[in-house]
């Protein structure tokens, strides 16, 4: 049985203010059972960016259809980027439970925001 890997291929992404940022994340196994969530930052101060359960997350869309079966692509797009969005984004797999528990994190993608071109 294949051990789950969470692949965030981009160490860093630079986006101009007002544009959209795509943050890539793919997984290599459907196991363990449980959801994927995106956060900005690490530790207790981290900010939830997207999951299927909470929300709405009006600026976030999933790159793949949310109804796609056996999907391994959990990339997201964040629209209308502002300097406040700068930070490191983590794609994290949770193990199903009561409550769900964090199982494994991607290495993170650092988002930097450039000034809007004049």
């Amino acid at each position: 049985e294949e051990e789950l890997q969470i692949i965030q291929p981009d160490k860093s992404v630079s986006v101009a203010a007002g544009e959209s940022a795509i943050l890539h994340c793919t997984i290599t196994s459907l196991f363990p059972v449980g959801p994927i969530q995106w956060f900005r930052g690490a530790g207790p101060a981290r900010v939830l960016i997207y999951n299927q359960r909470q929300g709405p997350f009006p600026r976030v869309t999933t790159v793949s259809e949310t109804t796609k079966r056996e999907n391994m692509d959990f990339s997201i797009s964040i629209s209308n980027i502002t300097p406040a969005d700068a930070g490191t984004y983590y794609c994290i797999k949770f193990r199903k439970g009561s409550p769900d528990t964090e199982f494994k994190s991607g290495a993170g993608t650092e988002l930097s925001v450039r000034a809007k071109p004049s």
């Epitope: 049985e1 959801p35 793949s64 259809e65 109804t67 079966r69 056996e70 999907n71 009561s98």
Partner: antibody, heavy 120, light 108 residues
Framework: DVQLVESGGGVVRPGESLRLSCAAS????????MTWVRQAPGEGLEWVST??????YYADSVKGRFTISRDNSKNTLYLQMNSLRAEDTAVYYC???????????????WGLGTLVTVSS | EIVLTQSPATLSVSPGERATFSCRAS??????LAWYQQRPGQAPRLLIY???IRETGIPERFSGSGSGTEFTLTITSLQSEDFAVYYC??????????FGGGTKVEIK
């Protein structure tokens, strides 16, 4: 073609044990969660248990009495049922889970079921 | 635990007619709802998932709609093989996965 074939059902007395098996073919068994669902005579469907890789989940009504397991080398799912009660009498179906990417699981293939009767 | 309530319990319809029945969830399940058909003496068969997506091989006369707490399954022109029991199932919040009590579609 996906095929799920249950076996191991039968008539037992209350308090006894039974082990159900489900032989799977036509898909990469080790890649998918698997589930047992039961249906009492003339009643609706009731979820019993689900297994991922090693992670297991149970309905409250069977927790502590039933154990789900799998042998990926044999493409087989099991349900060990101990301390059986009259209310466990049902057809037990084995089902393959299908995962919707950001959500949960539903069941896209089902076996024909095996009947378990618990009676004194 | 999310409770699913299906109505009506029984629906009497003539062949060729339209059948519509509902599934109500006790709390919001977004679109995380599936529909199954169970013919007498057979195993359930997946018809619809994600509230509205037809499973491969399911005829177009079957359609699902709704989101949140109210869902509907519609069969536009009932064929003889459609007389069966239909169950909804939520997979938004589990364990446990929960099923509705079923709607039996019988010949009028």
């Amino acid at each position: 073609d996906v095929q799920l074939v249950e076996s191991g059902g039968g008539v037992v007395r209350p308090g006894e044990s039974l082990r159900l098996s489900c032989a799977a073919s036509g898909f990469r068994f080790s890649n998918f969660a698997m589930t047992w669902v039961r249906q009492a005579p003339g009643e609706g469907l009731e979820w019993v248990s689900t297994i991922g890789s090693g992670d297991t989940y149970y309905a409250d009504s069977v927790k502590g009495r039933f154990t789900i397991s799998r042998d990926n080398s044999k493409n087989t799912l099991y349900l060990q049922m101990n301390s059986l009660r009259a209310e466990d009498t049902a057809v037990y179906y084995c089902a393959k889970d299908s995962t919707v990417s950001w959500s949960g699981d539903f069941f896209d293939y089902w076996g024909l079921g095996t009947l378990v009767t618990v009676s004194s | 635990e999310i409770v699913l309530t299906q109505s009506p319990a029984t629906l009497s319809v003539s062949p060729g007619e339209r059948a519509t029945f509902s599934c109500r969830a006790s709390q919001n399940v977004k679109n995380d709802l599936a529909w199954y058909q169970q013919r007498p003496g057979q195993a359930p068969r997946l018809l619809i998932y994600a509230a509205r997506i037809r499973e491969t091989g399911i005829p177009e006369r079957f359609s699902g709609s709704g989101s949140g707490t109210e869902f509907t399954l519609t069969i536009t022109s009932l064929q003889s093989e459609d007389f069966a029991v239909y169950y909804c199932q939520q997979y938004y919040d589990w364990p446990p996965f929960t099923f509705g009590g079923g709607t039996k579609v019988e010949i009028k």
